[in-house]
Interface confidence: low
Amino acid sequence: FEIALPRESNITVLIKLGTPTLLAKPCYIVISKRHITMLSIKSGERIVFTFSCQSPENHFVIEIQKNIDCMSGPCPFGEVQLQPSTSLLPTLNRTFIWDVKAHKSIGLELQFSIPRLRQIGPGESCPDGVTHSISGRIDATVVRIGTFCSNGTVSRIKMQEGVKMALHLPWFHPRNVSGFSIANRSSIKRLCIIESVFEGEGSATLMSANYPEGFPEDELMTWQFVVPAHLRASVSFLNFNLSNCERKEERVEYYIPGSTTNPEVFKLEDKQPGNMAGNFNLSLQGCDQDAQSPGILRLQFQVLVQHPQNESNKIYVVDLSNERAMSLTIEPRPVKQSRKFVPGCFVCLESRTCSSNLTLTSGSKHKISFLCDDLTRLWMNVEKTISCTDHRYCQRKSYSLQVPSDILHLPVELHDFSWKLLVPKDRLSLVLVPAQKLQQHTHEKPCNTSFSYLVASAIPSQDLYFGSFCPGGSIKQIQVKQNISVTLRTFAPSFQQEASRQGLTVSFIPYFKEEGVFTVTPDTKSKVYLRTPNWDRGLPSLTSVSWNISVPRDQVACLTFFKERSGVVCQTGRAFMIIQEQRTRAEEIFSLDEDVLPKPSFHHHSFWVNISNCSPTSGKQLDLLFSVTLTPRTVDLT
């Protein structure tokens, strides 16, 4: 055999006796007729030798060490070569060692081409005999990062200050490439970072540095896991020991991209998180140990990546192919953050693209599934626009404002379904007619149904909220002058059962000038509470609204206002209220910015209440609450 090492190659080859065997006949390296048991070849040397036996692999091993100095000059980064080539070496068990020394401020990254690496614990061996032993250093101390076989998940290992990589190849192994490259990185400010990539289901067992011995004092080690979004990862600790801490606390920290509570801190004895969707990092942080009785910190853990269970295997079809101008968003409902780890919750399109929120648009059929431990963490918001561009075509046309059944069948709670109703300016107005008469939500008589309709102006410059209305009241219809949004908002999961109670029809009607007209047909059984739009903020300037209140022939209506004065102070114009009997047209006019509000009044026939605002001074707004109560007539006054 001839081994020639180029000058400046910084390579040393050592052939030495391996583990002694019980073979009777000894074997020697023969060089210049001398018989030796160890041969060292340095850079720039050329040596010819043979062996005195036919099976030297049973006696000798060869170590090829290359020192790479990144302290004094540039580093030879890139793919690492096997030098000398394995074909030039005797067929012995061989270990290639690369010893890279670098500044503390420089990060070094080992990148492993496929197949990636699998870490093994003490006493384990690799099936093909090929092992990778990786160590780093802290000052002068060598730290074992771990021993690895092929066919695993570890794709990159980042260290700083230096790295020693030993690749052990059995004599019969044909491998002639190192299988890794070295790159420089910025400082990682910790002992090492191990990246583990899962491309499908699988598991990985990983260990803290120096395992089963103690993890270096007060050090930090991070594992980065790359997991496809449609799979779930769970962490379980197989074995750990805690040292005796003098300062700080030994802990593991999870960092989950996109989480609002990073980092999630766990004690080693805690139950570790499961059902994580997508990528995450896990870090082990040591402490300052007691000098007298340090103990040891060590950790062996398993990451299991698998398809999620239960709900995630179901595919839901959302057919929006016959819909127009509609979008459906599934997103996380706002929650108060807690320190507790919260597994990911994802919605997937075609089971492939998974994200924490998803918007589906009209015109297509969508297949979705869920990756979520608890679907109550998600909700749906839907927007649909119904617009009329040609008043000649739309007039008297009606549309049903109903939540499509496809949406109701999804396993996620509907939060809002908003209809934006758009009309040509000054040409048409809108009327909303509910399937069941509506009650206006007030503090005095709040809605307690599982859903309400929130009606508001949809004109960007206009801050006008008509109110919140739920089924089971006395409001027969609501007429509005111009563009509005009607939002069905659910308040309880029982909406699914009560969905049949929803039902609102919108019709395009000839234009009228008032902002809104409420048609009220009170029932004899209850008191109807009504309040002006924009409650709490005040009726907008120069806005006029009316209530058309029906009084049955055999009843009398008592109209009651809930404060003595309106409280409005006008900057310009006048605020007034007109109460007009519909039969006789007799009317009373009240100046709201001056007069006291009327005392309770009795009406034997249907009547109008019209309230018109001035331009109020800020802070002195117009808010009125009134009630209508029917009682049977005792005397016929017709």
């Epitope: 300062r247 700080k248 609002t260 300052d288 706002p334 108060k336 953050q337 320190r339």
Partner: antibody, heavy 119, light 107 residues
């Protein structure tokens, strides 16, 4: 982006009360605790205490027990500091700052409110 | 309560020089120490958390070190905009306390 917007300067007489506000935007108020820090003219920073924005429970440093009250209105993302029976030594800039009860560094601060107490 | 003592009270340097600010705690506080910068008329700004952890958006010339009771804030090469008052803060236990501040001024 995260912002803490504090109310404007106040000039008060000894014995009066003042209520300072701090409006949180760009994040959910209840996700982080709110801390109050005082800085007297030409002096350093002094931590007054904090309020748990989830539960509304306040914690006061010893020097700020009694006349100082932290409160919240989560519906409008507001934190408040009320000081009663003002004294001239309460003259200072008062800062609200965002922290976490278990991660107590203050990553965002309000611009401060100067309270001047003078007869 | 934890008393934090900062030194020096004033540090006079020229731009480009290295600044070393010290903060000593009256008892061991592990790494529960944060550093803030305050310019005249402005709110404090978080520079370093947990003794040595950098904050995104803060220039890399600011670094922190120390654990236990002795801590250091280092500005590797002072820039004109770095002249300000620097405070350390203990977050070890209630009440949280601040040091009295170190004023970094132009020489």
């Amino acid at each position: 982006q995260v912002q803490l917007q504090q109310s404007g300067s106040e000039l008060k007489k000894p014995g009066e009360s003042v209520k300072l506000s701090c409006k949180a935007s760009g994040y959910t108020l209840t996700d982080f605790s709110m801390h109050w820090v005082r800085q007297a003219p030409g002096q350093g920073l002094k931590w007054m205490g904090w309020i748990n924005t989830e539960t509304g429970a306040p914690t006061y440093a010893d020097d700020f027990k009694g006349r100082f009250v932290f409160s919240l209105d989560t519906s409008v993302s507001m934190a408040y500091l009320q000081i009663s029976s003002l004294k001239s030594e309460d003259t200072a800039v008062y800062y609200c700052s965002r922290g976490r009860d278990y991660d107590p560094h203050f990553d965002y601060w309000g611009q401060g409110t100067l309270v001047t107490v003078s007869s | 309560e934890i008393v934090l003592t900062q030194s020096p009270a004033t540090l006079s340097l020229s731009p480009g020089e290295r600044a070393t600010l010290s903060c000593r705690a009256s008892q061991s506080i592990s790494d529960f120490l944060h550093w803030y910068q305050q310019k005249p008329g402005q709110s404090p700004r978080l520079l370093i958390k947990y003794a040595s952890q950098s904050i995104s958006g803060i220039p890399a010339r600011f670094s922190g070190s120390g654990s236990g009771s002795d801590f250091t804030l280092t500005i590797s090469s002072v820039e004109p905009e770095d002249f300000a008052v620097y405070y350390c803060q203990s977050a070890h236990s209630f009440p949280y306390t601040f040091g009295q501040g170190t004023k970094l001024e132009i020489k």
